[in-house]
C-alpha cells in the first residue's frame, strides 16, 4: 500500500483551510479523549479510479468520497482519518485531513474526497473514514467503513495499468490444443516480444473425480528476436489410462518485469464424449481460463471478452 507520488495533496475547499498529513493510524484523540466529538461520516463511497504518476505510469487508485451529516457536531469536527486496510496482508495505510479552520454553516452539504491510495489488481480492501476527534471510549462510533474489491488484470481498464502490463497483461497467447493419435496432446501458443523462457504445465484428472492422475512440465527456451510473435508447439505424451482424460494446460511466461509472478494463461480440455457407436466425438469447445500469478485474482471481467478466451481447435 502506498500513496501516489505526485502533486501536493490538497483537502482545502471554499470555506475550509485543510492540509493532508501522513498518519500513524493512531490519532492523538484515541489517547486523549475529548468531551465533544463529531458525528460519523455519511454516504461513504469507494470507486476505482486511475491516475498517472510524474513518470507517466498509470496506477489504479481508490477514490474515497463522503459527506457530513447536517448537525451541529460539525462545529467540533477537526478533521478526518482515512484508513485503507489490505484484508489479506493486514497492511494498513492512513492519512489525516487536518482542518486549519473551523467548519462554518454551509448552504450545501459538505463533501470530501481523496484519490491517492494506490491499490493492487485483484486485491480486497476495507476503507474507513474516522471523523476527528475520535469518540470517548463508550461514545457512539464516528466512523464508517466499506469494503472494496479491485478488479484483476483482465478488466479492460486495469489491463493497461503499469502493474498489469508489468505482469504481462497485454500478451495474448491464443492457446490451442490438439488431440493426436497415440495418447498425445499438442499445445500451441503465440510467443511474446521478449527473449524469455516459458513453461508449459500439463495436469490431468479423471472425469468423475477432481483428483490429479498425471502431470508433466515442459520448458521452452527463450526465443530469438525473429521468433517473437511466432507460434510455439509442445507435444505431451498423455497417461495411458483412458479415464485420465480431463486435461488442464497452463502456459507460464518468465518476463523480465515479473519473473516468477507473471500472469499465466490456461485452457482445460474435458474428457471426450463417447457416442453410441463408440467413436469419440470432437470436443466442441475447450473451456479457457486465465490463471493469475499468486498474488492476483482469478476474476474475469465482462468488458474484456476475448482476451485469451478463444475457441480452441482440434
Amino acid at each position: 500500500l502506498r500513496l501516489l507520488d505526485h502533486r501536493a495533496l490538497v483537502c482545502s475547499q471554499p470555506g475550509l483551510n485543510c492540509t493532508v498529513k501522513n498518519s500513524t493510524c493512531l490519532d492523538d484523540s484515541w489517547i486523549h479523549p475529548r468531551n465533544l466529538t463529531p458525528s460519523s461520516p455519511k454516504d461513504l463511497q469507494i470507486q476505482l479510479h486511475f491516475a498517472h504518476t510524474q513518470q507517466g505510469d498509470l496506477f489504479p487508485v481508490a477514490h474515497i468520497e463522503w459527506t457530513l451529516q447536517t448537525d451541529a457536531s460539525i462545529l467540533y469536527l477537526e478533521g478526518a482519518e482515512l484508513s485503507v486496510l489490505q484484508l489479506n496482508t493486514n497492511e494498513r495505510l492512513c492519512v489525516k485531513f487536518q482542518f486549519l479552520s473551523m467548519l462554518q454553516h454551509h448552504r450545501k452539504r459538505w463533501r470530501f474526497s481523496f484519490s491517492h491510495f494506490v491499490v493492487d489488481p485483484g486485491q480486497e480492501y476495507e476503507v474507513t473514514v474516522h471523523h476527528l476527534p475520535k469518540p470517548i471510549p463508550d461514545g457512539d462510533p464516528n466512523h464508517q467503513s466499506k469494503n472494496f474489491l479491485v478488479p484483476d488484470c483482465e478488466h479492460a481498464r486495469m489491463k493497461v495499468t503499469t502493474p498489469c502490463m508489468s505482469s504481462g497483461s497485454l500478451w495474448d497467447p491464443n492457446i490451442t490444443v490438439e488431440t493426436l493419435e497415440a495418447h498425445q496432446l499438442r499445445v500451441s501458443f503465440t510467443l511474446w516480444n521478449e527473449s524469455t523462457p516459458y513453461q508449459v504445465l500439463l495436469e490431468s484428472f479423471s472425469d468423475s473425480e477432481n483428483h490429479s492422475c498425471f502431470d508433466v512440465v515442459k520448458q521452452i527456451f527463450a526465443p530469438r528476436q525473429e521468433e517473437f510473435h511466432q507460434r510455439a508447439n509442445v507435444t505431451f505424451t498423455l497417461s495411458k489410462f483412458h479415464w485420465c482424460c480431463h486435461h488442464h494446460v497452463q502456459v507460464q511466461p518468465f518476463f523480465s518485469s515479473c519473473l516468477n509472478d507473471c500472469l499465466r494463461h490456461a485452457v482445460t480440455v474435458p474428457c471426450p464424449v463417447i457416442s453410441n457407436t463408440t467413436v469419440p466425438k470432437p470436443v466442441a469447445d475447450y473451456i479457457p481460463l486465465w490463471e493469475p500469478r499468486s498474488g492476483s485474482s482469478d476474476y474475469k471481467d465482462d468488458d474484456d471478452k476475448g482476451s485469451s478466451h478463444h475457441h480452441h481447435h482440434h
Epitope: Q45, I46, L87, N88, T89, N90, E124, S145, K146, N147, F148, L149, P151, S294, G295, S297, D298, Y299, D302
Partner: antibody
C-alpha cells in the same frame, strides 16, 4: 488448477467440538484469505468469518464469536475451522472458500451432524 | 447488518427462455454484490461480482444490472445446466450476508 479439498463428514454430540480442514492446491495459500460459510439442510448460506493465511488475522461473524476459531498451517497449505459447544442447530454443510469478499473457489463441503 | 431479499423464491422457466431474478439490499451497497449458482449436492459457484463482472469461464448469457439497493440477474436464454438455485451476496460491509435464494426450475 485451484482446488479446495475438505475433510470428511462428522457426527458429533451436543456440547462437543468439531474441526474441519480445507487443503488448498493450485495456488499459494498465503496469497488469499479463506472464508468459511455454512448451509443448514435445505436452507440458505450463512457467513461465519475469514482468516488470512498471510497475516493470521481473522474476522468472525458476531453470532460465532467466542465459539469459532479459524487457523491455517502454511506448511501443509491447510486451513482449519473449529466450532465448539455444538448444538443441534449447528447441523449443516460447512464450506471453505477462497478470498474474503466475493468467494471465487469453494471446497466440496463437509457435513457436520449434531445429534444426541 | 444488511438484509438481502431475493424474489421470487421459485421461478419456473422453459429452456431457451429468459430468466430474471431480483435481489434487494436493505441499504445501499454500491456495486458490492456477487451472484452464486448452486446445484443439488454441490458447492456454490461464483457467477458475477462487482454487480456486473462475470467470473472466469462464466458464459455471456449471465448478466447483472443494478447498483445501490436493487439488482437483477438475467439469464438470457436458459440452458439445461442453468436450472439451479441462485444466491446474491453483499460484500459492502461486515458481516457478509446472502439472500435466501431463488430456485430456477424447468417449466
Amino acid at each position: 488448477q485451484v482446488q479446495l479439498v475438505q475433510s470428511g463428514a462428522e457426527v458429533k454430540k451436543p456440547g462437543a467440538s468439531v474441526k474441519v480442514s480445507c487443503k488448498a492446491s493450485g495456488y499459494t495459500l498465503t496469497s488469499y484469505g479463506i472464508s468459511w460459510v455454512r448451509q443448514a439442510p435445505g436452507q440458505g448460506l450463512e457467513w461465519m468469518g475469514w482468516i488470512s493465511a498471510y497475516s493470521g488475522n481473522t474476522k468472525y461473524a458476531q453470532k460465532f464469536q467466542g465459539r469459532v476459531t479459524m487457523t491455517t498451517d502454511t506448511s501443509t497449505s491447510t486451513a482449519y475451522m473449529e466450532l465448539r459447544s455444538l448444538r443441534s442447530d449447528d447441523t449443516a454443510v460447512y464450506y471453505c472458500a477462497r478470498r474474503q469478499l466475493a468467494l471465487d473457489y469453494w471446497g466440496q463441503g463437509t457435513l457436520v451432524t449434531v445429534s444426541s | 447488518e444488511i438484509v438481502m431479499t431475493q424474489s421470487p423464491a421459485t421461478l419456473s422457466v422453459s429452456p431457451g427462455e429468459r430468466a430474471t431474478l431480483s435481489c434487494r439490499a436493505s441499504q445501499s451497497i454500491s456495486s458490492n454484490l456477487a451472484w452464486y449458482q448452486q446445484k443439488p449436492g454441490q458447492a456454490p459457484r461464483l457467477l458475477i461480482y462487482g454487480a456486473s463482472t462475470r467470473a472466469t469461464g462464466i458464459p455471456a448469457r449471465f448478466s447483472d444490472n443494478g447498483s445501490g439497493t436493487e439488482f437483477t440477474l438475467t439469464i438470457s436464454s436458459l440452458q439445461s445446466e442453468d436450472f439451479a438455485v441462485y444466491f446474491c451476496q453483499q460484500y459492502d460491509t461486515w458481516p457478509l450476508t446472502f439472500g435466501g435464494g431463488t430456485k430456477v426450475e424447468i417449466k
